[in-house]
């Protein structure tokens, strides 16, 4: 027993206060990160607090403003982009959000040499995507689903595509499903390294069924939003990849890149494009049944002005136990010979590791190994490879940055971050300058986040970029909850959990328990990161214990855990939450009559199924924007994990895994169902069907809809949502208001 001096009579203790819901809703304890906008090996741009764009030179220690806040304000710019020849800056204003990544905006081009905006041949508005070439100051942009090219900002545009049509043909930008579930970007065009070629995707959504929902707005009649959205088993977009020579775009026009024969024989997806050199490109393709991926390296044939993808340069990645890759199939990082590459995929023991592929995947050289996973390759230089993993001290929810010396044999490995600020920092990402001359480390916790600048050769810390001093001071008089990350061993499965405990936690007392769940395939909730959020408040002020559990289907602990849910979503994720709750009860400090569960999106699905599990464990629960049947969700995501909803494939489990099928089981729990009516992602249809099934079963429940809100329930809806959920939980747990 460790006796610690009590702070109860300490005068400092009396000034300490619990978190309030208002603190959370106001974002009082939000943190800042610093990601340099690198423009060379030793220079970066950063937008200062007063909105000047400042150039920092690490080696001289000097900085100067290249674009004043006055210029920014003159067009109400919220973002900027410097051309690689440093002659121009685009200024972005009138930001208008579309889906998760996509937005439209108005763009102005400012000439830094003369301090004036470029007049003549101004850009149309609104633009869907705009970017500089990697060299010089060519511009590519997408307007009304067509791609345009400018050799210089003041020049007239050259139109590359002509078939673009709203909701039908998308050029250079993804349709809904590719944006959300495959590319995770707002763009689908890629410049070659020196700007000679421009590659782009064309998505044909002509035959895709459309989801339609009402947007109520303020008018007499609601608008109808129509989105081509392929649900599980439906017709998918047809994708084609083209490449155009940007120096002579009219010469031969766009050239299509051939699809590998083994991919083209049935429905398929394009998953990513990586330029290797100006005349070599790497495309990744995926069968609709997503356990076979093909990486195809293509070369420009000068004589024919076409792209050739020899079968000898096709590399197949196949999974026999699940789907290909983790959440996405990983992308290659090419080495300096422009043919060999580094890539993360499963090793023979079922852990995702870095492999070096020189000729064939079969002859791949494994670079990392162990019962942990390599997560991201940041940079490969002539002599070093930088990557992140969760190896250190065997905590899957940590991220440290490692350097492997690939210039020496045998390669030596060094953890760059493991011992830097060990207590404060256990979850890092990194941002590298050209040739990894310098890099920034961004630490997300578990302590207060901090961003630092480092020398790429010695790893020496040069300076602190952002240490969140104001946040640190603001938290000095706050009673934050205690957090612990531990694991449960159950039937050969390791269940990692994070427990958030009230500030004066006493193991001899009984506390209400709230489970927060996400649980989607290849997700991770138990992470060593800093957060002051709603659940922090519930522990700090309302005295609840909150637990997050990573069960089967979650990531970065090997394929056995990850692929356990393959073709049977909604079973083991729920079982593992229930198992964990039983273990928490055994710990002795949980009031088993006051246990709740809540989740959002996939978490709303899991929380609904847990409430309807018939265990009697949960008194109440909340589902925000839940999936209720996998037949209602997007093809690309759903089929990756569930296969097709056809009789000869997996229709039976699609039917068995719905929330509606368990309507009767909600009779003995208090259920709060919440959804935005303009959810483009998990359609309101999901909650409408749950509500209908509950009504038909004559089961009482509570519900809240948010008019015209999407999957994020942002703005004032957020405040209303968390206030509403707080009241619901306090009532459930018999806590006074």
């Amino acid at each position: 027993i460790v006796l610690r001096p009590s702070r109860v009579h300490n005068s400092e203790e009396n000034t300490m206060r619990a978190l309030t819901l208002k603190d959370i809703l106001n974002g009082t304890f939000s943190y800042k990160t610093f990601f340099p906008n690198w423009i060379s090996g030793q220079e970066y741009l950063h937008q200062s607090a007063d909105n000047n764009i400042v150039l920092y030179n690490i080696e001289t220690g000097q900085s100067y403003t290249i674009l004043s806040n006055r210029t920014m304000k003159s067009v109400n710019a919220s973002n900027y982009g410097l051309s690689p020849d440093r002659q121009f800056v685009y200024l972005e204003s009138d930001y208008s959000k579309l889906w998760r990544y996509s937005y439209t905006a108005t763009y102005y081009i400012y000439d830094l040499s003369n301090g004036e905006f470029v007049r003549g041949n101004e850009l149309p508005r609104p633009i869907q995507y705009l970017c500089w070439s990697p060299v010089g100051s060519k511009l590519a942009y997408v307007y009304q689903n067509n791609i345009y090219l400018k050799q210089r900002p003041g020049d007239p545009p050259f139109q590359i595509t002509f078939n673009g049509r709203e909701n039908k043909i998308f050029n250079g930008i993804p349709d809904w499903v590719y944006e959300e579930e495959m590319l995770a970007t707002k763009y689908a065009l890629w410049w070659s390294p020196n700007g000679k070629f421009l590659a782009y995707a064309e998505f044909n959504d002509t035959d895709i069924p459309v989801i339609a929902y009402s947007y109520y707005g303020d008018e007499q009649y609601p608008r109808t939003i129509n989105i081509p959205y392929p649900k599980a088993g439906a017709k998918n977009p047809v994708v084609r990849i083209f490449i155009i020579d940007t120096t002579y775009p009219a010469y031969v026009g766009p050239q299509e890149v051939p699809v590998p024969a083994m991919i083209a024989s049935s429905d398929y997806y394009f998953s990513w494009l990586t330029w290797v050199t100006d005349e070599r490109v790497c495309l990744q393709w995926l069968k609709r049944v997503q356990n076979v991926s093909v990486l195809s390296i293509c070369d420009f044939r000068e004589d024919w002005q076409t792209w050739d993808c020899p079968k000898t340069q096709e590399h197949i990645e196949e999974s026999r136990t699940g789907w290909a890759g983790g959440f996405f199939v990983s992308t290659p990082v090419f080495s300096y010979d422009a043919i060999s590459y580094y890539k993360i995929f499963s090793d023979k023991d079922g852990y995702k590791h870095i492999h070096y592929i020189k000729d064939t995947v079969e002859n791949a050289i494994q670079i990392t190994s162990g019962k942990w996973e390599a997560i991201n390759i940041f940079r490969v230089t002539q002599d070093s490879l930088f990557y992140s993993s969760n190896e250190f001290e065997e905590y899957p929810g940590r991220r440290n940055i490692y350097r492997i010396s690939i210039g020496s044999y045998p390669p030596s490995k060094k953890c760059v971050t493991c011992h830097l600020r060990k207590e404060r920092c256990q979850y890092y990402t990194a941002s590298f300058s050209d040739y990894a001359k310098y890099y920034a480390l961004v630490c997300y916790g578990p302590g207060i986040p901090i961003s630092t600048l480092h020398d790429g050769r010695t790893d020496q810390e040069i300076k602190i970029l952002e240490e969140n001093k104001e946040l640190e001071n603001a938290l000095k008089n706050i009673q934050l909850p205690k957090e612990e990350i531990k694991k449960l061993e159950v039937d050969e499965i390791t269940l990692w959990y994070k427990m958030i405990l009230p500030p004066q936690f006493d193991r001899s007392k009984k506390y209400p328990l709230l489970i927060q769940v996400y649980g989607g395939p290849c997700s991770q909730s138990v992470r060593s990161v800093f957060a002051v959020n709603w659940i922090s408040y519930l522990a700090s002020k309302e005295g609840m214990v909150i637990a997050l559990v990573d069960g089967r289907g979650t990531a970065f602990q090997g394929d056995k855990l990850l692929y356990a849910v393959y073709r049977k979503l909604g079973v083991y994720e729920v079982e593992d939450q229930i198992t964990a709750v039983r273990k928490f009860i055994e710990m002795g400090f949980i009031d088993e009559k006051r246990i709740a569960i809540w989740g959002w999106s996939y978490g709303g699905y899991v929380s609904s199924l847990a409430l309807a599990s018939g265990t009697g464990l949960f008194k109440c629960g909340i589902a925000v924007a839940p999936v209720s049947s996998w037949e209602y969700y997007a093809s690309v995501y759903t089929e990756r994990f569930m296969g097709l909803p056809t009789k000869d494939d997996n229709l039976e489990h699609y039917k068995n895994s719905t929330v509606m099928a368990r309507a009767e089981y909600f009779r003995n729990v208090d259920y709060l169902l919440i959804h935005g009516t303009a959810d483009d992602n998990v359609h309101f249809q999901n909650s409408a069907q749950i509500a209908k099934a509950l009504v038909n079963a004559q089961v009482d429940f509570q519900a809240m809809w948010y008019s015209d809100q999407n999957h994020g329930l942002s703005g004032l809806s957020t405040n209303h949502l968390y206030t509403h959920m707080t009241h619901f939980l306090k009532q459930c747990f018999s806590l006074s208001d």
Epitope: G41, Q42, E59, T60, T65, L67, S68, R86, L112, G115
Partner: nanobody, 117 residues
Framework: QVQLQESGGGLVQPGGSLRLSCAVS????????MGWYRQAPGKPRQWVAG???????NYVGFAKGRFTISRDNAKNTVYLQMNTLKPDDTAVYHC???????????WGQGTQVTVSS
């Protein structure tokens, strides 16, 4: 205080050559990206060429193949070798950081280049 002193301009016939120099003081030239800019009468100033701290040159379209930017870090000087000059190249040539500072930054007097027969 950073100071920039350009020299080497003059009158030259079309097709001729000039080598401009820019002496830099008050900063470590070797660590800064530097650029040459020009301003013709009644026209806005425009960028001509830039050089990174690693010595890599970048050029605007009209300068490619005719102009060469270089640096001598020991002498704290940046150069612009201009060949095959045309009457259109007539302007006052300035050097500065690349990109230049905003507002009313330090610009030297510049050096006048006149291409005429």
């Amino acid at each position: 205080q950073v100071q920039l002193q350009e020299s080497g301009g003059g009158l030259v016939q079309p097709g001729g050559s000039l080598r401009l120099s820019c002496a830099v003081s008050g900063t470590m030239l070797s660590r800064n990206a530097m650029g040459w800019y020009r301003q013709a009468p009644g026209k806005p100033r425009q960028w001509v060429a830039g050089i990174t701290s690693d010595g890599l040159g970048n050029y605007v379209g009209f300068a490619k193949g005719r102009f060469t930017i270089s640096r001598d870090n020991a002498k704290n000087t940046v150069y612009l070798q201009m060949n095959t000059l045309k009457p259109d190249d007539t302007a006052v040539y300035h050097c500065n950081f690349w990109p230049p500072p905003s507002g009313r930054p330090i610009w030297g007097q510049g050096t006048q280049v006149t291409v005429s027969s």
